[in-house]
Interface confidence: low
C-alpha cells in the first residue's frame, strides 16, 4: 500500500531508479504525435545520516539530516529529488491541430540526491 | 511517531516552514563562533495530484504525479524539496585554531516546490 | 586573568551615532574573537556583531548601520553606531574568546546606550 511505501524499512538510499512513461498510459496518445514515450525515470531512497558523498546533499540537507535525528516528529528527513534534469524534444498537435516541435525542460531525471 | 510522520492524512500542501537551528543543539558550537545560528527553514508537505502553480512544479513532476497516480506502490509522489537556497556567512575556528569568515552556500530554505 | 572595559555609551537622539570601545588587558594568547552583544531591559542578551582577523559578522538587525573593526596593537575592538533607533537602546557589552574555547570566556561590565526618539 501507499502507506507502506514511507516505512523506512523497506528504502535504500537514495538513487535513481529507471522509469519508461508511455504517453498512452498517460492518455496524452491524442495530441503527442512523437516520441510515444520516454525513460523519464525517478528519484527515490532514504536520505538517512550520515549523508554521504553520493547522495549530493547540500549543505542545508545535512543540517536538517542532524536536526531530524534530534526532533523527528517534529522536522522531517530531507527529500530523495532529482538535482539533474533533462529536457525532451515532443511533436504534438495545438489547439488549432497545427503540428508544433518543441523542447520540454525538466523531463528526464539524470541525477538524484538529497534535499 | 517518525512513520505517522509520513502518513498523507496529517499533511498538508508542500510549503516552506519556519525553523531556527541553534549550532550549539547541533554540537557545532566549538567551532563556530558566530552566528549562535539561524533560520534555516524546512520544505514538507503533500504533493498530490493535481499540482498547483505555487508547488512550483517541474514538468518531471507533473508527469510522475500522473505515473503515481496509476502505480501507487511502485512510483511514490514527487517530494517536496527546496527550490530557492541562500548562503549564509559563518565565522569558525579552523584546524589550526586561525579565525575564518566563510560564505556557506545552500543553507536557508527561502522556497519550497514539487520535484 | 584577562579584564574587559567598554566605554563609549551614552544618550543620543534617534539617526545619531556613538562609537563604543572594548579594550582587553592581561594574559591574553591569541586574541581571537570578540563580540558584541546587547541586553535591553526585560529581554533576552541578543548578538550584535562578531570582530576578529578574518572579518566582522553582523546580527540582521544591526546589519548595514554598525560597523565594528579592531586595533590589535591595542588590544581593542570598536563598534561603530550609525542611525541609531530607539529600538538600540540597551546594556552593550563585549566578550572574548580565546583560541580553543568553547564559548566567550570574559565578559566586560557593559556599557549603557539609549537612544531618545
Known amino acids: 500500500s501507499a502507506s507502506d511505501y514511507n516505512s523506512s524499512e523497506l528504502k535504500t538510499a537514495c538513487r535513481k531508479h529507471e522509469l519508461y512513461v508511455s504517453f498512452q498510459d498517460l492518455g496524452w496518445q491524442d495530441w503527442i504525435i512523437a516520441p510515444k514515450g520516454y525513460a523519464a525515470n525517478y528519484c527515490d531512497g532514504e536520505c538517512s545520516f550520515p549523508l554521504n558523498a553520493h547522495m549530493n546533499a547540500t549543505n542545508h540537507a545535512i543540517v536538517q539530516t542532524l536536526v531530524h535525528l534530534m526532533n523527528p516528529e517534529y522536522v522531517p528527513k530531507p527529500c530523495c529529488a532529482p538535482t539533474k534534469l533533462n529536457a525532451i524534444s515532443v511533436l504534438y498537435f495545438d489547439d488549432n491541430s497545427n503540428v508544433i516541435l518543441k523542447k520540454y525542460r525538466n523531463m528526464v531525471v539524470r541525477a538524484c540526491g538529497c534535499h | 511517531s517518525a512513520s505517522d510522520y509520513n502518513s498523507s492524512e496529517l499533511k498538508t500542501a508542500c510549503r516552506k516552514h519556519e525553523l531556527y537551528v541553534s549550532f550549539q543543539d547541533l554540537g557545532w558550537q566549538d567551532w563556530i563562533i558566530a552566528p549562535k545560528g539561524y533560520a534555516a527553514n524546512y520544505c514538507d508537505g503533500e504533493c498530490s495530484f493535481p499540482l498547483n502553480a505555487h508547488m512550483n512544479a517541474t514538468n518531471h513532476a507533473i508527469v510522475q504525479t500522473l505515473v503515481h497516480l496509476m502505480n501507487p506502490e511502485y512510483v511514490p509522489k514527487p517530494c517536496c524539496a527546496p527550490t530557492k537556497l541562500n548562503a549564509i556567512s559563518v565565522l569558525y575556528f579552523d584546524d589550526n585554531s586561525n579565525v575564518i569568515l566563510k560564505k556557506y552556500r545552500n543553507m536557508v530554505v527561502r522556497a519550497c516546490g514539487c520535484h | 586573568e584577562v579584564q574587559l572595559v567598554e566605554s563609549g555609551g551614552g544618550l543620543v537622539q534617534a539617526g545619531g551615532s556613538l562609537r563604543l570601545s572594548c579594550a582587553a588587558s592581561g594574559s591574553i594568547r591569541g586574541f581571537v574573537a570578540m563580540a558584541w552583544y546587547r541586553q535591553a531591559p526585560g529581554k533576552q542578551r541578543e548578538w550584535v556583531a562578531t570582530v576578529t582577523n578574518g572579518g566582522t559578522l553582523y546580527g540582521d538587525s544591526v546589519k548595514g548601520r554598525f560597523t565594528g573593526s579592531r586595533d590589535n596593537a591595542k588590544n581593542t575592538v570598536y563598534l561603530q553606531m550609525n542611525s541609531l533607533k530607539p529600538e538600540d537602546t540597551a546594556v552593550y557589552y563585549c566578550?572574548?574568546?580565546?583560541?580553543?574555547?568553547?564559548?566567550?570566556?570574559?565578559w566586560g561590565q557593559g556599557t549603557q546606550v539609549t537612544v531618545s526618539s
Open positions: 566578550a572574548l574568546r580565546q583560541i580553543g574555547a568553547s564559548g566567550y570566556d570574559y
